[in-house]
Interface confidence: low
């Protein structure tokens, strides 16, 4: 629905009248930043504002998911005249301000990236005191986290009529291709569900009917690497055992 104007509008006349970008509200963020899981990434964000010299209190905020309403992952506040932005929130301690908000720079460093960090981030600055202005990037920066495959679950489950099936779930970005190998199988991509709804980096492959005892191996591969895990099926005494 339509966003209300309070806290959601920009000084458009400054945009039109002043040729210097330093004299209007604007925010510069790249469309996307890519980094590998486990590494660190820098989310650049710089801004301009219409106040010639603003030295009052300010707050720098980063939020994830959606602008204006998404959860905050980082927040810091700088007192009047201070160049130090005191961190008030850093989700899981992994977010750190690299830029200096007094120098119109809100760039953020994200440590120890995980695939769950793959989302859009929005920077915001709030001035307080003499002026009550705040501005947030509308489109944000997409953090694209890449990762070599990792098999997160492999299991053998009973099926109707005393049969067994095997499930293999792996994560990675790009989403990995899964293949099964095992007795009388060769290599099989049987019943791959890719990716699971709501779990964008997870891929599951099912072997619907295990016809022979022995070792079944699931291999996950993408452009960054490969991973494999095995389960063992023993049907004597009607039991099954799994080992990875």
């Amino acid at each position: 629905f339509v966003r209300t104007k309070i806290d959601t509008t920009e000084n458009l006349l400054n945009t039109e009248v002043h040729s210097s970008p330093a004299q209007r509200w604007s925010m510069q963020v790249p469309p996307e930043v890519s980094a590998e899981a486990g590494d660190a990434a820098v989310l650049p964000c710089t801004f301009t504002h219409p106040h010639r010299h603003y030295d009052g209190p300010l707050t720098a905020i980063w939020r994830a998911g959606e602008p204006y309403a998404g959860p905050q992952v980082f927040r810091c506040a700088a007192a009047r005249g201070s160049e130090l932005c005191q961190t008030a929130l850093s989700l899981h301690g992994r977010f750190r301000l690299l830029g200096n908000p007094r120098r119109n720079d809100l760039s953020l460093r994200v440590e120890r990236l995980a695939l769950a960090d793959d989302r859009r981030y929005f920077c915001r600055v709030e001035f307080a005191g003499d002026v009550h202005d705040r501005y947030e990037s509308r489109h944000g920066v997409r953090l694209h986290v890449t990762a070599a495959p990792r098999i997160v679950n492999i299991s053998v489950l009973p099926s109707p009529a005393h049969a067994f099936r095997a499930l293999c779930t792996a994560e990675g970005e790009p989403p990995p291709a899964l293949a099964w190998s095992g007795p009388a199988l060769g290599n099989s991509l049987a019943a791959v569900r890719s990716p699971r709804e709501g779990h964008g980096h997870l891929v599951t492959a099912e072997l619907p009917a295990l016809t022979h005892d022995g070792r079944y191996t699931c291999t996950a591969a993408n452009s960054l690497g490969r991973s494999e895990a095995s389960v063992y099926l023993f049907r004597f005494h009607g039991a099954s055992g799994a080992s990875t």
């Epitope: 959601t8 509008t9 920009e10 458009l12 915001r124 947030e136």
Partner: antibody, heavy 123, light 112 residues
């Protein structure tokens, strides 16, 4: 240069409908909310409602619910207001007006206006 | 709905003299963020309205500095320090605090 170009004057019969257009240029259409304002002959200004061209979301003055329908075509950067079941009291000049916004409170109100469209309802 | 009331209805002015228009709202237009969401527009004869003042006291770009806005949460004033012939028209105040946005009834400024 930002401009809002409205469609020409219309003469309509009571009970009929009319669709007024407002073509925006000089800016990214989806970055502005479009508002519509009514001015009856010799009268003041009345806010009808607004549409967010990016999402199609609308907000109406209760008085104009069921009378005015706001739409927007992003492909042509044009906003529309359709007035239905026209009566003589709908005779007025209708303005579209907009201003840029993003997630900040540094607004300036309705800085840009169309030239107005006169809708005359007469049998 | 917030009701906006303007006075006077008509204001005859002498070029070079000051002029003042009042506007009152039935609810405070002061938001918790410190902004007062009151705006002034001028509609010259045969033209679309144009913005004069935004957020109670900020002069819109291109508007001569003889115009100024002031007020509190519910009582507002538009002042013209020295009226010029081109200032004739109908002046409207408007609240932009909440839907539906509402205008005052207008004040017609004309040269004596």
């Amino acid at each position: 240069e930002i401009q809002l170009q409205q469609s020409g004057a219309e003469v309509k019969k009571p009970g009929s409908s009319v669709k007024v257009s407002c073509k925006a240029s000089g800016y990214t259409f989806t970055d502005y909310d479009m508002h519509w304002v009514k001015q009856a002959p010799g009268q003041g200004l009345e806010w009808i409602g607004t549409i967010d061209p990016e999402t199609g979301g609308t907000a109406y003055n209760q008085k104009f619910k069921g009378k005015a329908t706001l739409t927007a075509d992003r492909s042509t950067s044009t906003a529309y207001m359709e007035l239905s079941s026209l009566r003589s009291e709908d005779t007025a000049v209708y303005y579209c007006t907009s201003f840029y916004y993003t997630y900040s409170n540094y607004d300036v109100g309705f800085a840009y206006w169309g030239q107005g469209t006169l809708v005359t309802v007469s049998s | 709905d917030i009701v906006m009331t303007q006075s006077p209805l008509s204001l005859p002015v002498t070029p070079g003299e000051p002029a003042s228009i009042s506007c009152r709202s039935t609810k405070s237009l002061l938001h918790s963020n410190g902004n007062t969401y009151l705006y002034w527009y001028l509609q010259k004869p045969g033209q679309s309205p144009q913005l004069l003042i935004y957020r109670m006291s900020n002069l819109a770009s291109g508007v001569p500095d003889r115009f100024s806005g002031s007020g509190s949460g519910t009582d507002f004033t538009l002042k013209i320090s020295r009226v010029e012939a081109e200032d004739v028209g109908v002046y409207y105040c408007m609240q932009h605090l909440e839907y539906p946005f509402t205008f005052g009834g207008g004040t017609k400024v004309e040269i004596k």
